[in-house]
């Protein structure tokens, strides 16, 4: 029950996280800036991974895609790549985890297969979350290190005087959405990995039960299993899950080196 709950919660948390990563990637508010109160109109500029928008005091907003811009910074391309990789891995992870959910029965899929799928999706969620956190952090680092801040200098050219406007960009809402979403995806992935441990068939050492017979005769365990002496009992019984509980006697024992042929 705890395993099912952990797996289900991990799935839901990861789903919310990946939705957040997608939202952050699409958002325009990665960085925001009040340019200054221009004598004509107050201008508010905000920029995302894909386009830059300008909102005027009148409420008019215009956005331009970066596809018209030559020489995009390599860092921006890296952030884009990280976010897209995060989304793709997360989406695949979600798809895998749906089939891995213990509460969903698909044919005669064994728990060992579900455990493997749960682990796979968990790892995918972890990597997806890390990609998102890395992408957002790289962008934030660009802002912190004044990558986006123009120095106030003037120079004259053929077209007259060019003055760069002192602009300091601040963290936009998308950065916080990205960090939280990446964190949720990461937590969801960890929960899936934890759930995988509970699903996986594992070797359990049961206390040996010896059936002692008089003399050197052998004792037979019920159920037509191999006979064994009271001295070399097979203590390593493998658990086999098929969705229902089994008693110890119902568990198939494997031959040990002490078993008689």
């Amino acid at each position: 029950m705890a395993v099912t709950a952990c797996q289900g919660l991990g799935f839901v948390v990861s789903l919310i996280g990946i939705a957040g990563i997608i939202a952050a990637t699409c958002m325009d508010q990665w960085s925001t800036q009040d340019l200054y109160n221009n004598p004509v109109t107050a201008v508010f500029n905000y920029q995302g991974l894909w386009r830059s928008c300008v909102r005027e005091s009148s409420g008019f907003t215009e956005c331009r895609g970066y596809f018209t811009l030559l020489g995009l910074p390599a860092m921006l391309q890296a952030v884009r790549a990280l976010m897209i990789v995060g989304i793709v891995l997360g989406a695949i992870g979600l798809l895998v985890s749906i089939f891995a959910l213990k509460c969903i029965r698909i044919g005669s899929m064994e728990d060992s297969a579900k455990a493997n799928m749960t682990l796979t999706s968990g790892i995918m969620f972890i990597v997806s979350g890390l990609c998102a956190i890395a992408g957002v952090s790289v962008f934030a680092n660009m802002l912190v290190t004044n990558f986006w801040m123009s120095t106030a200098n003037m120079y004259t050219g053929m077209g007259g005087m060019v003055q760069t406007v002192q602009t300091r960009y601040t963290f936009g809402a998308a950065l916080f959405v990205g960090w939280v979403a990446g964190g949720l995806t990461l937590i969801g992935g960890v929960m899936m990995c934890i759930a995988c441990r509970g699903l996986a068939p594992e070797e359990t050492n049961y206390k040996a039960v010896s059936y002692h017979a008089s003399g050197h005769s052998v004792a037979y365990k019920p159920g037509g299993f191999k006979a064994s002496t009271g001295f070399g009992s097979n203590t390593k019984n493998k658990k086999i899950y098929d969705g229902g509980a089994r008693t110890e006697d119902e568990v198939q024992s494997y031959p040990s080196k002490h078993d008689y042929v």
Partner: nanobody
Framework: QVQLVESGGGSVQPGGSLRLSCAAS????????MGWYRQAPGKQRELVAG???????NYGDSVKGRFTISRDNAKNTVYLQMNSLKPEDTAVYYC??????????????WGQGTLVTVS
């Protein structure tokens, strides 16, 4: 690099008209505001008229009702139609553009100026 090319200046009699134009070219990503400023000898530079991408306009007090600013966004060009010119309108007229030249790069570009003489 962003270049501004101004044209249309010259000498005119009082009450006459002139049309100034300013074309922006170069590494322009997004022009936000285009406008005109003027500076008479021994005076501070002042706003004549400005126009944002959204169509917001602002005029200097001394030119309201006489000057009209217009803009062709497709050509990155701004025009200033000056009517009923007065001798006090004599000045060097500078084109001014606020440009988003790239990601996180904002430029305020000034033209070299065109002289308007009313006498």
């Amino acid at each position: 690099q962003v270049q501004l090319v101004e044209s249309g200046g010259g000498s005119v009699q009082p009450g006459g008209s002139l049309r100034l134009s300013c074309a922006a070219s170069g590494s322009i990503f997004h022009i936000v505001v285009m406008g005109w400023y003027r500076q008479a000898p021994g005076k501070q530079r002042e706003l004549v008229a400005g126009m944002s991408t959204g169509g917001t306009t602002n005029y200097g007090d001394s030119v309201k009702g006489r000057f009209t600013i217009s803009r062709d966004n497709a050509k990155n060009t701004v025009y200033l139609q000056m009517n009923s010119l007065k001798p006090e309108d004599t000045a060097v007229y500078y084109c001014n553009v606020l440009v988003i030249s790239g990601i996180g790069s904002h430029l305020e570009v000034w033209g070299q100026g065109t002289l308007v003489t009313v006498s």
